[in-house]
């Protein structure tokens, strides 16, 4: 049994880091493998992650972490029974993938304005709370070419757009994702999408 693709990990910079790797053949990850991880720090204890299958030869493990900060560095040991298959390290702050925003809502009751709001996925005491920026994707269910991205570079988790910038009388969907420049993160996953019917009064023409 050998590791074909070494584990690569990303952290949500809050409580979970996800590591993925591939073995050289079909593997029952949860019964055959264990990923041990330990913070390089005074008094830290070793923890064991039981991986799940991710395709025939792929494995994924969700590492639980408390109080993630930039100084943290973890040692990783991948074991198959008594055999050490791979040894490495992981610094969560250097591989951050933020959590996806939630609770995306479209408010259509403001005259001729669409207000989209969502929730910041981090608590106020997490460093990323005040450092997320967002991308909002809006698309038409009827017209695949009617697809747009709005970059939200301010901190407030909301976006206002004129209803008239979208076509009237058809349904639209929206979703939002986040990233943080300070840690050069990857984009988060998209939030679940939300749907609304866009209707507004055309301005009266003389």
């Amino acid at each position: 049994m050998k590791v074909l693709q070494e584990p690569t990990c990303v952290s949500d910079y809050m409580s979970i880091s996800t590591c993925e790797w591939k073995m050289n053949g079909p593997t029952n990850c949860s019964t055959e493998l264990r990923l041990l991880y330990q913070l390089v720090f005074l008094l830290s204890e070793a923890h064991t992650c039981i991986p799940e299958n991710n395709g025939g030869a792929g494995c994924v493990c969700h590492l639980l972490m408390d109080d993630v900060v930039s100084a943290d560095n973890y040692t990783l040991d991948l074991w198959a029974g008594q055999q050490l298959l791979w040894k490495g390290s992981f610094k969560p702050s250097e591989h951050v993938k933020p959590r996806a925003p939630g609770n995306l809502t479209v408010h259509t009751n403001v005259s001729d304005t669409l207000l989209l709001t969502w929730s910041n996925p981090y608590p106020p005491d997490n460093y990323l709370y005040n450092h997320l920026t967002y991308a909002v994707n809006i698309w038409s269910e009827n017209d695949p070419a009617d697809f747009r991205i709005y970059n939200v570079t301010y901190l407030e988790p909301s976006l206002r757009i004129a209803a008239s910038t979208l076509k009237s009388g058809i349904s639209y969907r929206a979703r939002v994702r986040a990233w943080a420049q300070c840690y050069n993160t990857t984009w988060s996953e998209w939030s679940p999408s939300t749907k609304w019917h866009n209707s507004y009064r055309e301005p009266f023409e003389q």
């Epitope: 720090f41 005074l42 008094l43 830290s44 204890e45 408390d66 109080d67 900060v69 930039s70 100084a71 943290d72 460093y127």
Partner: antibody, heavy 116, light 111 residues
Amino acid sequence: QVQLVQSGAEVKKPGASVKVSCKASGYAFTSYYMHWARQAPGQGLEWMGIINPSGGSTSYAQKFQGRVTMTRDTSTSTVYMELSSLRSEDTAVYYCARGKWWFYDWGKGTLVTVSS
Amino acid sequence: QSVLTQPPSVSAAPGQKVTISCSGGSSNIGNSYVSWYQQLPGTAPKLLIYDNNKRPSGIPDRFSGSKSGTSATLAITGLQTGDEADYYCGTWDTSPSMIPLFGTGTKLTVL
């Protein structure tokens, strides 16, 4: 919000022991390390040791090895610091502080006076 | 005796900028992260800066931190009378054993 409430001031004689408590609230007690530091009158801060409330393991500054004991009670979210064989130079304000690589939150401090 | 050296005192007028230095070595500041603490008279220390340059929520952006090599600097702009306090740097010694270190402390006087 996070609160670290320490026990009240103590006056001790040389050779005696003192036990200072620090009750934590407002966060997951076992998810954060707790440090102890002290500050003699008019002096700077001095680190004494650290306890992991999850398992109770400890590490002490070399200067205090053999004289200090840190414990915790997870049922009351309280950590304790006991210093024995007190001498006059142990007169100081003793602080508990939550954190790992740095100290996020501090207790208000407990003044321990050692005097004959 | 701390191995992190700070100036004993600094002073400046309200509205001015002041910097406080913290000098260490390769086994501490040079190989670790720096934090800064403010201790107002008669109170417990309070975290001002961590991770060399990050501010906890609630700390105004008048306070900033930086690190270069084996030394670190705390800068305070737009000085206010309420900033008069003792300031301590902190880091970790990584050799021979891991222990936290505090600087010698600097008394800031707002003239």
